[in-house]
Structure formats: structure tokens, C-alpha cells
């Protein structure tokens, strides 16, 4: 059974992941982003089901495409903090949260999504899990 300290650790990791995802979304989803129109043309796979921490496997598998699209956004008038570091941090948290005991085959929804829809989906996921822990 999960202890209160492990629950607290999970909660903090989820909050960190949530903040990182929100910061990415805040950085791209505004009119000052000169590459937004182009970024919205890239398609991301969405999880068919995302209700448990193990479903973070589906996020992990999309981190490489996410990094590529974020690299596209970099310009002198637009700054995300170092994309490689950001994605690496997210990857570390995701690996810790989902655990490595069981490797899940991720099931994706039929419809693909824009980067904004993709990030919003995983933000909602984090918020939902956090609310069950508190």
C-alpha cells in the first residue's frame, strides 16, 4: 500500500510535471509566438485512455516529437527555456511516476491532435490525478 510519504512525493512530482506542461503551453499558445500557426500544423497522438500513472507511457512516447516542435518555436522574439533540458526534466519525472515494473503498450485514440490540444490533455490528466491524491 502506498505510504503517505510516497503519496506526497508522487503529488510533488505531478505538480512539477503540471507546471512544466503549463509553462510550455503558456509559451506557445499566445499571439506573440511567431511560429504558432506553423506549430499547429503538427499532429500529436492522444491516449485512448489516461486515468492512471502507468498511462504516462503515452506521454513519454510523444516527448521526442514535442521537443522537435518546440525547437521550431525558438526565435529571437520568442523564448522557451532550454528545450532539451525541459524535455529531459519531463522525461525523468514521467519515468519515475509511471514506474518501470510493467511496460504498457500505449493505446492511442484514432484522432490526432494539435500541440495545444495535446498539452491541455496531459495538463488535465495531471490535475485529475493530483485531485485524487489530495
Amino acid at each position: 500500500a502506498p505510504t503517505s510519504s510516497s503519496t506526497k512525493k508522487t503529488q510533488l512530482q505531478l505538480e512539477h510535471l503540471l507546471l512544466d506542461l503549463q509553462m510550455i503551453l503558456n509559451g506557445i499558445n499566445n499571439y506573440k509566438n511567431p511560429k504558432l500557426t506553423r506549430m499547429l500544423t503538427f499532429k500529436f497522438y492522444m491516449p485512448k485512455k489516461a486515468t492512471e500513472l502507468r498511462h504516462l507511457q503515452c506521454l513519454e512516447e510523444e516527448l521526442k516529437p514535442l521537443e522537435e516542435v518546440l525547437n521550431l518555436a525558438q526565435s529571437k522574439s520568442f523564448h522557451l527555456r532550454d528545450t532539451k533540458d525541459l524535455i529531459s526534466n519531463i522525461n525523468v519525472i514521467v519515468l519515475e511516476l509511471k514506474g518501470s515494473e510493467t511496460t504498457l503498450m500505449c493505446e492511442y485514440a484514432d484522432e490526432t491532435a494539435t500541440i495545444v490540444e495535446f498539452l491541455n490533455r496531459w495538463i488535465t490528466f495531471c490535475q485529475s490525478i493530483i485531485s485524487t491524491l489530495t
Partner: antibody, heavy 126, light 111 residues
């Protein structure tokens, strides 16, 4: 001093079109993004659209996407909002507001929505 | 879209007394550039909105120092230290971290 003056409002039937204008003075219009915001009678504020300083990028609220078009003429210091397929729920006072400043090195800065026009009333009714 | 929720809906205050308005955002408003783009607007009866505060706590030019803003992340507050008759109107919080969204407004009236 900064001045924004909207015009073009009036009473229009559902399904018809209307074009609003916003005449700007007192600042370098071609260096600023510009917004349209609306306010239904007795209600709160709703962002409608934004256009970049150079007119290249335009973004819209979902409620008006595909029906409204924002544009600008920097030589005339004027912002426009072309409203097609008007609906009763588009009835509102429409305000133009100044957005962020874009400098020559390619950076946006400054406050969004720092100056507003007096507004022009659009009534959609049969 | 980011949802901005303001409380209270209405705030009857006595002249010279303080007033406080809260605003909560559905998302953290910290932008990747390090700024938090949360503003406060005042709309007097029959007037267009007017910018009071930007980036949480910066007073716009010409705004009296009785107005102050505070907060971080998702929770923000506008305070009027001593309410004057000219402060009557509706106050809106708004975010421009993402595409702009407004709070529902708080009506400040004199008791």
C-alpha cells in the same frame, strides 16, 4: 495622446454583414498589435480577435472564427473588423484596444490592452 | 481556454475603507519568459475599460497608488486601500499569458 475611435456600428439583421473601423492616433500604429474586444449589454468583456503589427498573423476567438476578419491599414492608421453572418448573440459594444509594442529587433514588449476606444454598438435584430 | 474566476460578484464598501477583489485562474499563468501576464481593468459606469495594473502588480501610468495588485501562479488580488467615490464601477481581472480571457467582473459600490 493616444486615441482610439471606433465607428461603423448600427442595427443589422441576422445573417447580414457589417464593417467596424478603429482610427488610431497619438502613437506609432504600425509598431503595435491591435485587439477587438466586445461587451454584450449588461455583461462582461469577451476578447474577439488580434492582429500583429504588420498584419501577418491574425487570431480569433472560437465564437467568431470563420465569420469575422480582422485587418489593418498602417498607411491610414486604421484597424478593421469585418463581421459576416451576424447572429443575435453578436449584439454588443465593440472596443478596439492597443496590444504589445514590437520593436525593430523583433521583440514584443509593453502592456497589452493599455488603451481602449469608447466603443461602437452593434445590434443584431430582425 | 484559461478560465478566470472572480470573487465577490459585488462588493459594497464604505468611503475611505479598503476593498479587496480575488481572481483565480484555471491554469498557472507563469509564462516561459518568466513574466506572469495578469492585469486588472476598471470600468466606470458608461465608460470603456481602463488598465489599472499589469503583470500582477505594476500600476499603469496615472493610476493612483491606493490601487495595488499581488499574487502568483493561479491566485491574484486587487486591493484598494481607501475607496473613493470615483472608484465605483466594475473591476475585471484578465490574463494575456495565453490568448486573452477575462474574469466575470466585480461590482464595487458605495454602501
Amino acid at each position: 495622446q493616444v486615441q482610439l475611435v471606433e465607428s461603423g456600428g448600427g442595427v443589422v439583421q441576422p445573417g447580414r454583414s457589417l464593417r467596424l473601423s478603429c482610427a488610431a492616433s497619438g502613437f506609432t500604429f504600425s509598431s503595435y498589435a491591435m485587439h477587438w474586444v466586445r461587451q454584450a449589454p449588461g455583461k462582461g468583456l469577451e476578447w474577439v480577435a488580434v492582429i500583429w503589427y504588420d498584419g501577418i498573423n491574425k487570431y480569433y476567438a472560437d465564437s467568431v472564427k470563420g465569420r469575422f476578419t480582422i485587418s489593418r491599414d498602417n498607411s491610414k492608421n486604421t484597424l478593421y473588423l469585418q463581421m459576416n453572418s451576424l447572429r443575435a448573440e453578436d449584439t454588443a459594444v465593440y472596443y478596439c484596444a492597443r496590444g504589445s509594442y514590437y520593436d525593430s529587433s523583433g521583440y514584443y514588449f509593453g502592456e497589452d490592452f493599455d488603451y481602449w476606444g469608447q466603443g461602437t454598438l452593434v445590434t443584431v435584430s430582425s | 481556454d484559461i478560465v478566470m474566476t472572480q470573487t465577490p460578484l459585488s462588493s459594497p464598501v464604505t468611503l475611505g475603507q479598503p476593498a479587496s477583489i480575488s481572481c483565480r485562474s484555471s491554469h498557472n499563468l507563469l509564462h516561459s519568459d518568466g513574466n506572469t501576464y495578469l492585469s486588472w481593468l476598471q470600468q466606470r459606469p458608461g465608460q470603456p475599460p481602463r488598465l489599472l495594473i499589469y503583470e500582477i502588480s505594476n500600476r499603469f501610468s496615472g493610476v493612483p497608488d491606493r490601487f495595488s495588485g499581488s499574487g502568483a501562479g493561479t491566485d491574484f488580488t486587487l486591493k484598494i486601500s481607501r475607496v473613493e467615490a470615483e472608484d465605483v464601477g466594475v473591476y475585471y481581472c484578465m490574463q494575456v499569458t495565453q490568448f486573452p480571457t477575462f474574469g466575470g467582473g466585480t461590482k464595487v459600490e458605495i454602501k
